[in-house]
C-alpha cells in the first residue's frame, strides 16, 4: 500500500461529549475515495501508545489496538466509502476523555484532525410547560 507522501487530504472532526456508561460517537469525515480497499482509518488518543481503532482494506484491523479500548470501538463500515470515519465508542468511561486524532490515508494522500472528547454524567434538560 503506497501513498504519494506529501499530498494531503481534508479531514474534519467535531468536538463532542459522551455520557459515562452509554455509547458515544467521535465524529470524523474526509474526502472520500473511489475504492474502499484504498482507505485506512486510524484513531489515536493522546497519551495512549496503542491504537484506539484501525480500519483498512474494508475491515477492522485490531492487532495494535490498546487494551483500554478492546471490544469497545467500531466504525460505520458501510459509510466509510462516502467519507465517514466516525468512531462509535461503547460503554464510555471517564478515562476516555481527552484529545483524539483521526488519521486518514487514501490513494489521494493522507490527512488528520484532532478532536476534544469530554465525558461525564450529562442529562437532557427538563422542559416544564
Amino acid at each position: 500500500f503506497g501513498i504519494s507522501g506529501r499530498h494531503s487530504i481534508t479531514v474534519t472532526t467535531v468536538a463532542s461529549a459522551g455520557n459515562i456508561g452509554e455509547d458515544g460517537i467521535l465524529s470524523c469525515t474526509f474526502e472520500p475515495d473511489i475504492k474502499l480497499s484504498d482507505i485506512v482509518i486510524q484513531w489515536l488518543k493522546e497519551g495512549v501508545l496503542g491504537l484506539v481503532h484501525e480500519f483498512k482494506e474494508g475491515k477492522d484491523e485490531l492487532s495494535e489496538q490498546d487494551e483500554m479500548f478492546r471490544g469497545r470501538t467500531a466504525v460505520f463500515a458501510d459509510q466509510v466509502i462516502v467519507g465517514n470515519a466516525s468512531l462509535r465508542l461503547k460503554n464510555v468511561q471517564l478515562t476516555d476523555a481527552g484529545t483524539y486524532k483521526c488519521y486518514i490515508i487514501t490513494s489521494k494522500g493522507k490527512g488528520n484532525a484532532n478532536l476534544e472528547y469530554k465525558t461525564g454524567a450529562f442529562s437532557m434538560p427538563e422542559v416544564n410547560v
Epitope: 507522501g5 506529501r6 489515536l44 493522546e46 497519551g47 495512549v48 501508545l49 496503542g50 490498546d66 490515508i105
Partner: antibody
Framework: EVQLLESGGGLVQPGGSLRLSCAAS????????MHWVRQAPGKGLEWVSA????????YYADSVKGRFTISRDISKNTLYLQMNSLRAEDTAVYYC??????????????WGQGTTVTVSS | DIQMTQSPSSLSASVGDRVTITCRAS??????LAWYQQKPGKAPKLLIY???NLPTGVPSRFSGSGSGTDFTLTISSLQPEDFATYYC?????????FGGGTKVEIK
C-alpha cells in the same frame, strides 16, 4: 534545556537486580511517553520498554517481560527501570528516551547519555 | 514483531557523495518510521520522523522518503560529520523495533 540523565548502572552478578533512574528536566514530563532502549557492546539498538505519559500503560520487549518493570514518578520527574533476574545478555548501555508527538506515532527526540549495565560473575 | 531490515549494513563514501540507505518493514507501517544517527560512544540522534519530516536543527541535506514497507534515508552531499551509524525504527507497533544499522565509513 530539555535533558535526560540516567543513573544506576553498574556491575551485577547473574540473577541479581538493579534499578535504573532517568531524571528529566526542561519539559512537561507527564505529557510525554518514555522509553528505555539498550545497546549491547558492538551491537545495534534494541527497544526494551515504554510507558505512557500518565503511567497507565506499559509495554515490554519479549526478552525482558516478567523480569523488568518500567515506572515513572511524576512528582520527581523521574523514569525508572527495575531489572530483576539479570542475565549476561542484559549487558548493555541503557538509554532513556522521550517520545516525540502527542499520540505516540513519531520517533524518540531526546535521549540521555546512557548508563552501563554489566552482568557478570 | 515487525522486522526492520536495513541495507547495506555498511558503506564507504567520500565527502560530497550522495548516500542512500534503505529500510524494509516486514509489514505495512504506513509512515510510522524514524531515522537516527549515532556516533561512537554517543546517544542516538533523531534525524527523521513520520518517514519524511526533519526535526528542528537537522540539516536539510538529510531527507526521508517512502511509505508502507519501503523507506529511504538520503544524504544529498555527505559531510565529514556525517560519518556514523544510521538506524531506522518503526512505531506502528507497540513492540517498537529498530533496523540492524548502516555504518557509513570514509572511503
Amino acid at each position: 534545556e530539555v535533558q535526560l540523565l540516567e543513573s544506576g548502572g553498574g556491575l551485577v552478578q547473574p540473577g541479581g537486580s538493579l534499578r535504573l533512574s532517568c531524571a528529566a528536566s526542561g519539559f512537561t514530563f507527564n505529557t510525554h511517553a518514555m522509553h528505555w532502549v539498550r545497546q549491547a557492546p558492538g551491537k545495534g539498538l534494541e527497544w526494551v520498554s515504554a510507558i505512557s505519559g500518565s503511567g497507565g500503560s506499559t509495554y515490554y520487549a519479549d526478552s525482558v517481560k516478567g523480569r523488568f518493570t518500567i515506572s515513572r514518578d511524576i512528582s520527581k520527574n523521574t523514569l525508572y527501570l527495575q531489572m530483576n533476574s539479570l542475565r549476561a545478555e542484559d549487558t548493555a548501555v541503557y538509554y532513556c528516551a522521550r517520545l516525540l508527538g502527542r499520540f505516540g506515532e513519531y520517533g524518540m527526540d531526546v535521549w540521555g547519555q546512557g548508563t552501563t549495565v554489566t552482568v557478570s560473575s | 514483531d515487525i522486522q526492520m531490515t536495513q541495507s547495506p549494513s555498511s558503506l564507504s563514501a567520500s565527502v560530497g557523495d550522495r548516500v542512500t540507505i534503505t529500510c524494509r518493514a516486514s509489514q505495512n507501517i504506513y509512515t510510522w518510521l524514524a531515522w537516527y544517527q549515532q556516533k561512537p560512544g554517543k546517544a542516538p540522534k533523531l534525524l527523521i520522523y513520520d518517514a519524511t519530516n526533519l526535526p528542528t536543527g537537522v540539516p536539510s541535506r538529510f531527507s526521508g522518503s517512502g511509505s508502507g514497507t519501503d523507506f529511504t534515508l538520503t544524504i544529498s552531499s555527505l559531510q565529514p560529520e556525517d560519518f556514523a551509524t544510521y538506524y531506522c525504527q518503526q512505531s506502528y507497533s507497540t513492540r517498537w523495533t529498530f533496523g540492524g544499522g548502516t555504518k557509513v565509513e570514509i572511503k
